[in-house]
Interface confidence: low
């Protein structure tokens, strides 16, 4: 399987909410001994391998933000811990999973990575990740809503916070 990042760049105004999205592309084994873990973390560019460094998102580690379920099941993170930090990661039945960050500040700017691990019990795992950049802007040049740039082309798309989940 692979992980697709529909958007490689998100440009948002300060104070806005944004939902960063990844998509799990098949084939996905739905056997009873197959477990999927999905999570998010921050990283930095200029490394030997993108996303190899794992830094917290608003002080929450990738362990704190993980989703655990089999196949294409829906799941949510532990609400109390994440929501206290203005975060929520979620997953739907179609392989899409996301992290929502509320009330963005300039400190949220950076490289974000989604990670999917397929674990077949008593066998090796398969790990894949996707990367995307978030730029939070302030001042008169900042957009009024988040602008996203698709990974496959340079066309941009204007989105509002509550519509993010529909852009898959």
């Amino acid at each position: 399987f692979k992980v697709a990042t529909p958007y490689s760049l998100y440009v948002c105004p300060e104070g806005q909410n944004v939902t960063l999205t990844c998509r799990l592309l098949g084939p996905v084994d739905k056997g009873h001994d197959v477990t999927f873990y999905k999570t998010w973390y921050r990283s930095s560019r200029g490394e030997v391998q993108t996303c190899s460094e794992r830094r917290p998102i608003r002080n929450l580690t990738f362990q704190d933000l993980h989703l655990h379920h089999g196949g294409h099941q829906a799941a949510n993170t532990s609400h109390d811990l994440a929501q206290r930090h203005g975060l929520e990661s979620a997953s739907d039945h179609h392989g899409n999973f996301s992290i929502t960050m509320r009330n963005l500040t300039l400190l949220d700017s950076g490289l974000y990575c989604c990670l999917v691990v397929e674990i077949r019990h008593h066998h090796s795992e398969h790990r894949v990740h996707g990367a995307m950049e978030l730029q939070v802007q302030t001042g008169k040049d900042a957009p009024s809503n988040c602008v996203v740039y698709p990974s496959s082309s340079q066309e941009s798309e204007n989105i509002t916070a509550h519509h993010h989940h529909h852009h898959h």
């Epitope: 873990y37 030997v48 362990q63 704190d64 993980h66 691990v117």
Partner: antibody, heavy 121, light 108 residues
Framework: QVQLVESGGGVVQPGRSLRLSCAAS????????MHWVRQAPGKGLEWVAH????????YYADSVKGRFTISRDNSKNTLYLQMNSLRAEDTAVYYC??????????????WGQGTLVTVSS | EIVLTQSPATLSLSPGERATLSCRAS???????LAWYQQKPGQAPRLLIY???NRATGIPARFSGSGSGTDFTLTISSLEPEDFATYYC?????????FGQGTKLEIK
């Protein structure tokens, strides 16, 4: 700072049992996978067992499978290794090690100082 | 089981010299899931390098890792007195997780 403190080692006769403990502090224990690694006197390192962050999955080296049981109590921030049917070749310093991941294994980023287990008649 | 073979078993060098330690796997270690540890007598191992080439937090820049597939190398560019120890490679690609037998770096 992160601290892992092993205890429970000692001298035991072949065929007997022993339980090792590893008390963790300085990090969110319940978010990390953990391992036991051992080192026979004058020898190299040998991975023994691995447990997921929530205790739901456990993996063992063939040399200890069926004899050793890894477990954890997240409410007490403690990792355990129950060792049954001990053999002379189990004599080693046993290290508790934190995994950098929470389920599947990555590298071991923190280690305890170890506890010595001697199996001898 | 992936068998890791380290060479040389012992390496005798002087402070200031460059040390090159090798770790060869019996089968390919996918995604470079290989780590290096340093261990001094009476102490626990310490993580130096992960994912074959990434330095762990607090590890000096003189330590570097390279390689992929079946051949991996740990290089210490200019040896400091505190670097004389035993070094182990470890793969975390598949169960059982295995270590090399170690390379002892001693003062010449």
């Amino acid at each position: 700072q992160v601290q892992l403190v092993e205890s429970g080692g000692g001298v035991v006769q072949p065929g007997r049992s022993l339980r090792l403990s590893c008390a963790a502090s300085g990090f969110t224990f319940s978010s990390y996978a953990m391992h036991w690694v051992r080192q026979a006197p004058g020898k190299g390192l040998e991975w023994v067992a691995h447990i997921w962050y929530d205790g739901s999955n456990k993996y063992y080296a063939d040399s200890v499978k069926g004899r050793f049981t890894i477990s954890r109590d997240n409410s007490k921030n403690t990792l355990y290794l129950q060792m049954n049917s001990l053999r002379a070749e189990d004599t080693a310093v046993y290290y508790c090690a934190r995994d950098s991941g929470f389920y599947e294994s990555y590298y071991f980023d923190e280690w305890g100082q170890g506890t010595l287990v001697t199996v001898s008649s | 089981e992936i068998v890791l073979t380290q060479s040389p078993a012992t390496l005798s060098l002087s402070p200031g010299e460059r040390a090159t330690l090798s770790c060869r796997a019996s089968q390919s270690v996918s995604s470079s899931y290989l780590a290096w540890y340093q261990q001094k007598p009476g102490q626990a191992p310490r993580l130096l390098i992960y994912d074959a080439s990434n330095r762990a937090t607090g590890i000096p820049a003189r330590f570097s890792g390279s390689g992929s597939g079946t051949d991996f190398t740990l290089t210490i560019s200019s040896l400091e007195p505190e670097d004389f120890a035993t070094y182990y490679c470890q793969q975390y690609n598949s169960y059982p997780y295995t270590f090399g037998q170690g390379t002892k770096l001693e003062i010449k």
